[in-house]
């Protein structure tokens, strides 16, 4: 996941926010799956 060539603060910020959203979605799915399997 390189997200392009820009290294300015805004590009870095947008990438960081994307990672946070992605991880939240993945962890949320895993949590729901665990609850479902109980």
């Amino acid at each position: 996941h390189s997200d392009g060539i820009f290294t300015d603060s805004y590009s870095r910020y947008r990438k960081q926010m994307a990672v946070k959203k992605y991880l939240a979605a993945v962890l949320g799915k895993r949590y729901k799956q665990r609850v479902k399997n109980k």
């Epitope: 390189s2 997200d3 392009g4 820009f6 603060s9 805004y10 994307a18 959203k21």
Partner: antibody
């Protein structure tokens, strides 16, 4: 280069999906954004999608548009279209929109 | 959503002269510098000129320069050429991307 496709004449309320493809670089390595321009008007930022598939939209979108991606395409799905959505729709590379396609024209008319 | 207000059109410039276009945001952009400038000619897509307020995009002549911080930004074209006749847009990036928006555009006429 970047190329948009899928624009056509539709009636109000008809859903429409636009597609963005790339040549000369790997689309999967870049965040991609969508921008539109009504005839004779200015540019309007719609939203973008990260390499992780997470999305951000302009506040005015209100859930009517959805951006998604595969390894080779980025799509813009539009619903509840009105005549106000008549515009040329551009796909552009990365958060700074550094490389643009020629655009695809969407005309919404009854 | 943020509102970006640009210098009213048209702005007239003489070949070899200097043009200044201003962009004012209703709220501070991210890190006080998340602002870009684009050039668009009739029938063509926009072209990135400046990003992060003052960074020249790849392949853009250095007669284009950007400055400013927070809510006030400026695009300057020095040694204006006929080829610079176009409409110029600013784009602001914000803490919440839902606020991202373009300015209304400024047309530059070269005489």
């Amino acid at each position: 280069s970047v190329e948009e496709s899928g624009g056509r004449l539709v009636t109000p309320g008809t859903p429409l999906t636009l597609t963005c493809t790339a040549s000369g670089f790997s689309l999967s390595r870049y965040a991609m954004g969508w921008v539109r321009q009504a005839p004779g008007k200015g540019l309007e930022w719609i939203g973008d999608i990260s390499t992780y598939g997470t999305t951000d939209y302009a506040s005015w979108v209100n859930g009517r548009f959805t951006i998604s991606r595969t390894s080779t395409t980025v799509t813009l799905k539009m619903t509840s279209l009105t005549t106000e959505d008549t515009a040329t729709y551009f796909c552009a590379r990365d958060y700074w929109l550094s490389l643009w396609g020629q655009g695809t024209l969407v005309t919404v008319s009854s | 959503a943020a509102v970006l207000t640009q210098t009213p059109s048209p702005v007239s410039a003489a070949v070899g002269g200097t043009v200044t276009i201003k962009c004012q945001s209703s709220q501070s952009v991210y890190d006080n510098n998340a602002l870009a400038w684009y050039q668009q000619k009739p029938g063509q897509p926009p072209k990135l000129l400046i990003y992060a307020a003052s960074n020249l995009a790849s392949g853009v002549p250095d007669r284009f320069s950007g400055s400013g911080s927070g809510t006030q930004f400026t695009l300057t074209i020095s040694g204006v050429q006929c080829d610079d006749a176009a409409t110029y847009y600013c784009l602001g990036g914000y803490d919440d991307a839902a606020d991202n928006a373009f300015g209304g555009g400024t047309e530059v006429v070269v005489k």
